[in-house]
């Protein structure tokens, strides 16, 4: 019983004056609370609470369920308690079979005893199975049995409270322990796509997948540098014990340019947080940007191959691609493919393969591409380098020798005179007239050059060489002269191929 200090409020006193009372089932429970400021009696067992405003608590025929703590409280809020055991051989345990434990915490198996004098109060596995070796517990007849530091491996463990009564083991009803896992790692988060490119008015939808050991993981979509709550839809799965998956889908039904930005899926648990981001770019209309992978002015030697290559960005996806030359569309010799197999790829490559180009195949090669919003094109000017070809070499009526040569780049024509029978013509002769003629062929074709010299300058027998050359090669033509008295004759001109 409490000691009383004069002048200070004191707790009530209870009769009988002991902390514990044992009564037999069917007997009377009579508890008297003495206090000038009596307020109430309170009875507690498991989750049950009863109150009584009478200062004497009387239960005429005690039952096992009357086992519990009886507390008397006065107007000062001071209280005193007595614990009553109602011994019932047929009901040794009071039970609340709800049994949840948090991993690494203690949890109480609520099976308080109705008889404190039974022995070997402990836990046992169901159907004779042993308890886990590392399971430790502390029995308390008034509360139950405390399992220390619950492990995840105990999930769904079947248990009985057990006592020995008159040499026999008596088991309570069974308990199933449900373990709520502790978070021992951050959630695993992933996003359906790392970046999105949309046109105004299109729907933006992105899904974040969150995986963790339980559904109590928190997750949300956030817009970077914004506090606005985003509209999310959720879906969840239980894939087995401690294997939970949630999908959080963020949707903007009609995206606008100002919706562009970085969106973060954030998840956290008591261990820590994780996040993943996705980038949204909204454009007012589609686009195509073409990037030539080689110079758009191309020089290639006659008979050689060249690949015209472009990369281009197209959004939305390209619908039509073509290569054109001289108003004709190539049906083959080209290929078009995405730069990567990535779902969000907008970059593509197109290659036109030109093989064994002829001098006549120079010109403008155009790549055209279109999507639902725009068209774009790029032109390549292809020049075929050709060795000069001497088209004509004549003695004109006015006594001029004329040489006309074609090639690309533009040929240069030099003249040489070889006196007598010498093979090498080294003495150069200056032309009287040099003209570049307009070719009647296609643009980018060979360039035609005409050069003339005055034959009256030659006073001896010999050979005149017309030599046309450029970066690719050279070709010569020869005029033979013989004098008969004062008359000069042109003998058959001839050309020599010089590689």
């Amino acid at each position: 019983q409490p000691s009383v200090s004069p002048g200070e409020p004191s707790p009530p006193s209870i009769h009988p004056g002991k902390s514990d009372l044992i009564v037999r089932v069917g007997d009377e429970i009579r508890l008297l609370c003495t206090d000038p400021g009596f307020v109430k009696w309170t009875f507690e067992i498991l989750d049950e609470t009863n109150e009584n405003k009478q200062n004497e608590w009387i239960t005429e025929k005690a039952e096992a369920t009357n086992t519990g703590k009886y507390t008397c409280t006065n107007k000062h809020g001071l209280s005193n308690s007595i614990y009553v055991f109602v011994r019932d051989p047929a009901k040794l345990f009071l039970v609340d079979r709800s049994l949840y434990g948090k991993e690494d915490n203690d949890t109480l198996v609520r099976c308080p005893l109705t008889d404190p004098e039974v022995t070997n109060y402990s836990l046992k596995g169901c159907q004779g199975k042993p308890l886990p070796k590392d399971l430790r517990f502390i029995p308390d007849p008034k509360a139950g049995i405390m399992i220390k530091s619950v492990k995840r491996a105990y999930h769904r463990l079947c248990l009985h409270c057990s006592v020995d009564q008159e040499g026999k083991s008596v088991l309570s009803e069974k308990f199933i322990l449900k373990v709520r896992p502790a978070f021992k790692a951050v959630p695993v988060v992933s996003v359906s796509k790392a970046s999105y490119l949309l046109r105004e008015g299109e729907e933006f939808t992105v899904t974040c997948t969150i995986k963790d050991v339980s559904s109590s993981v928190y997750s949300t979509w956030k817009r970077e540098n914004s506090q606005t709550k985003l509209q999310e839809k959720y879906n969840s799965w239980h894939h087995g014990d401690f294997n939970y998956e949630r999908q959080a889908t963020l949707t903007i039904s009609s995206a606008r340019v100002n919706d562009s930005g970085v969106f973060m899926c954030y998840a956290n648990n008591t261990f820590g947080s994780a996040n993943v981001t996705t980038t949204l770019e909204v454009v007012d209309k589609g686009f195509i940007n073409i990037f030539p992978m080689i110079n758009t002015t191309v020089f290639v030697n006659d008979g050689e191959n060249v690949d015209l290559i472009v990369e281009y960005e197209a959004f939305p996806k390209p619908e039509h691609q073509q290569w054109i030359y001289m108003n004709r569309t190539f049906t083959d010799k080209w290929e078009d493919y995405p730069k990567s197999e990535n779902e969000s790829n907008i970059r593509y490559v197109s290659e036109l393969h030109l093989t064994r180009l002829k001098g006549t195949e120079g010109g403008t090669y155009t790549f055209l591409v279109s999507n639902s919003d725009v068209n774009a094109a790029i032109a390549f000017n292809v020049y075929v380098n050709t060795k000069p070809e001497i088209l004509t070499y004549d003695r004109l009526v006015n006594g001029m020798l004329q040489c006309v040569a074609a090639g690309f780049p533009e040929p240069t024509i030099d003249w040489y005179f070889c006196p007598g029978t010498e093979q090498r013509c080294s003495a150069s002769v200056l032309p009287v007239d040099v003209q570049t003629l307009n070719s009647s062929g296609p643009p980018f074709g060979k360039l035609v050059v005409q050069s003339s010299i005055d034959s009256s300058a030659f006073k001896h027998n010999g050979t005149v060489e017309c030599k046309a050359y450029n970066d690719v090669g050279k070709t010569s033509a020869y005029f033979n002269f013989a004098f008969k008295g004062n008359n000069k004759e042109q003998i058959h001109p001839h050309t020599l191929f010089t590689p």
Epitope: S98, S215, Y218
Partner: antibody, heavy 119, light 107 residues
Framework: EVQLLESGGGLVQPGGSLRLSCAAS????????MSWVRQAPGKGLEWVSA????????YYADSVKGRFTISRDNSKNTLYLQMNSLRAEDTAVYYC????????????WGQGTLVTVSS | DIQMTQSPSSLSASVGDRVTITCRTS??????LNWYQQKPGKAPKLLIY???RLESGVPSRFSGSGSGTDFTLTISSLQPEDFATYYC?????????FGGGTKVEIK
Amino acid sequence: EVQLLESGGGLVQPGGSLRLSCAASGFTFSDYPMSWVRQAPGKGLEWVSAIGGSGGDTYYADSVKGRFTISRDNSKNTLYLQMNSLRAEDTAVYYCARGAYDGEGFDYWGQGTLVTVSS
Amino acid sequence: DIQMTQSPSSLSASVGDRVTITCRTSQSIGSYLNWYQQKPGKAPKLLIYSASRLESGVPSRFSGSGSGTDFTLTISSLQPEDFATYYCQQTYNTPWTFGGGTKVEIK
């Protein structure tokens, strides 16, 4: 002892709104996902909505999506269901239920509150 | 959404009979199936969770079995207090869905 007590039901006209509440006691409210389940007169059970323990994640049946909003106030141990644009077919007894351990069903139910949508 | 097909929709049986109710799902749900009992004017009561696990306080004459898409609730020996409507429910994937119910009546 776990207890769930629904309130807020009543008669409402089509197109109207109601807010149901469910007061929880006897357990750590924030540890448990909670659900609303309804039962039209003479019909079976229909799951309506659920919310995670933190209130971060919410789930809805297709029949109520966009009209109903589930929420919770863990400081008050209370679950809510805001029902807008009510239709005659929403007439039912609405139960609040506690989700047991993950995926293991609803182990505690309230007594239900009747919502009647009629003109 | 996962569809739940419960059969039969009703059955008549006598006290002591063995009663079997089946539930089929439109896709595999592992073992995430629960069974409830509901009596007129009362809230449902969880009987079986995770397909085969008996909820605390539920008599052992109730048992559940199955996994994947096919599940069964069995009452080994029907008692007078077992006359009620029984529902299956999947909690594998949201939206969680219930079967149509099976009413067990006295023959």
